[in-house]
């Protein structure tokens, strides 16, 4: 009965996310088979978060969107170990929004979830940001110094990276 | 007073090129992102190309892209537009424009008087 | 590539009356509270002058009989009250995505 009835929950919960995610891909999270953890299918995991590159080309307003019509939002970088994991999927002679603007062009930058700005956790080319009037943030590859942020022109269309929470069942 | 003057448009045969050029006075060009607008004779509007204030990034649509190079020199208050392989359809009024930033947006705030291309054999 | 589309094509309206031009995107523009819609005022022979910013922000300069309304995919330029002067060809263009468009433009004239 007991198992039955998480059963039911487990099968309510996934229905909900289905109009997003119509497959996930579940692992057993500890020694619990009660705990699952899931994120959608192609996305990659890391710690508790799910991730996806999106490949179209859109600028950073509709990148957004587009995170946000799957439950997600641009990615918001907190570590040095969640950037290199991103950086494992990602092609280097393409350009990736982050979920990091300057809407106001004053230097104020800010996250799309709210975390706050951390200037001892940001991993900007070397003499980037240099532009007022570029108030969206990129990753990209440069090949003296490896993978990092710059700030370009929100409406440029580039790729992206989507993240939210791992989805637990 | 803001001011952009355009120059070097002229007649070209197609397969041809041009270097326009825009010299701007009235601000401090160097931290300006500046554009290229054209317009075709009795038509509409349209966006040619971006250079952002450093020279670094430039922007094209799809119609230009490969054709032409945005630049700009910012020790001479110049910006340039060298057009290449051009076809009749370049044929317009060559418009350099002020970018100013509007949150995730931008108007175009400043408009020279335009140079005319004429692609034309 | 975002398109825009203006109507009517020309307009003639009398002096003192009500002037108004619709802009349509085929998709939103808008974005936390912003519509990236601009519009410029072409007169024979000149530049565009720029005369609204984000769809209702009138620019530095520009009498305020000019007017700028809408969001989402739907815009309106407003003249409350036709002057002479205000003969000319006038331009919707969105900025939230590069290729950056203009609507076709809408000739205003005076009947």
């Known amino acids: 009965n007991f198992m039955y009835s998480k059963t039911v929950k487990r099968l309510s919960k996934l229905r909900e996310y289905q109009q997003y995610h119509p497959s996930l891909t579940c692992v057993m999270e500890g020694k619990d088979i009660e705990d699952w953890s899931c994120c959608p299918t192609p996305w990659t995991s890391f710690q508790s978060s799910c991730y996806f590159i999106s490949t179209g080309m859109q600028s950073w307003t509709k990148s957004q969107k587009n995170c946000s019509v799957m439950g997600a939002d641009l990615v918001v970088i907190n570590t040095r170990e969640e950037q290199d994991f991103i950086i494992q999927n990602l092609k280097r002679n393409s350009s990736y929004f982050l979920g990091l603007s300057d809407p106001g062009g004053r230097r104020h930058w800010q996250w799309v979830d709210q975390t706050p700005y951390n200037e001892n956790v940001t991993f900007w080319h070397s003499g980037e940001p240099n532009n007022l009037d570029e108030r969206c943030a990129i990753i990209n590859f440069r090949s003296s110094e490896e993978w990092g942020w710059n700030d370009i022109h929100c409406h440029v269309p580039q790729k992206s990276i989507c993240k939210m929470k791992k989805i637990y069942i | 007073e803001v001011q952009l003057l355009e120059s070097g448009g002229g007649l070209v045969q197609p397969g041809g090129s041009l270097r326009l050029s825009c010299a701007a006075s009235?601000?401090?060009?160097?931290?300006?992102?500046m554009s290229w607008v054209r317009q075709a004779p009795g038509k509409g509007l349209e966006w040619v190309s971006t250079?952002?204030?450093?020279?670094?990034?430039?922007y094209y649509p799809d119609s230009v892209k490969g054709r032409f190079t945005i630049s700009r020199d910012n020790s001479k208050n110049t910006l340039y537009l060298q057009m290449n392989s051009l076809r009749a359809e370049d044929t317009a009024v060559y418009y350099c424009?002020?970018?100013?930033?509007?949150?995730?947006?931008?108007?175009?705030?400043?408009w020279g008087q335009g140079t005319t291309v004429t692609v034309s054999s | 590539d975002i398109v825009l589309t203006q109507s009517p094509d020309s307009l003639a309206v009398s002096l003192g009356e009500r002037a108004t031009i619709n802009c349509k995107a085929s998709?939103?523009?808008?974005?936390?509270?912003?519509?990236?819609v601009n519009w410029y005022q072409q007169k024979p022979g000149q530049p565009p002058k720029l005369l609204i910013y984000?769809?209702?922000n009138l620019e530095s300069g520009i009498p305020d009989r000019f007017s700028g309304s809408g969001s989402g995919t739907d815009f309106t330029l407003t003249i409350s009250s036709l002057q002479a002067e205000d003969v000319a060809v006038y331009y919707c263009?969105?900025?939230?995505?590069?290729?950056?468009?203009f609507g076709g433009g809408t000739k205003v004239e005076i009947k």
């Open positions: 424009a002020t970018y100013r930033p509007y949150y995730y947006g931008s108007v175009l705030d400043y």
């Open positions: 009235g601000f401090t060009f160097s931290t300006y992102t």
């Open positions: 250079i952002n204030s450093g020279g670094d990034n430039t």
């Open positions: 998709q939103s523009v808008d974005y936390d509270g912003n519509s990236y």
């Open positions: 984000g769809a209702s």
């Open positions: 263009q969105q900025s939230d995505e590069d290729p950056w468009t």
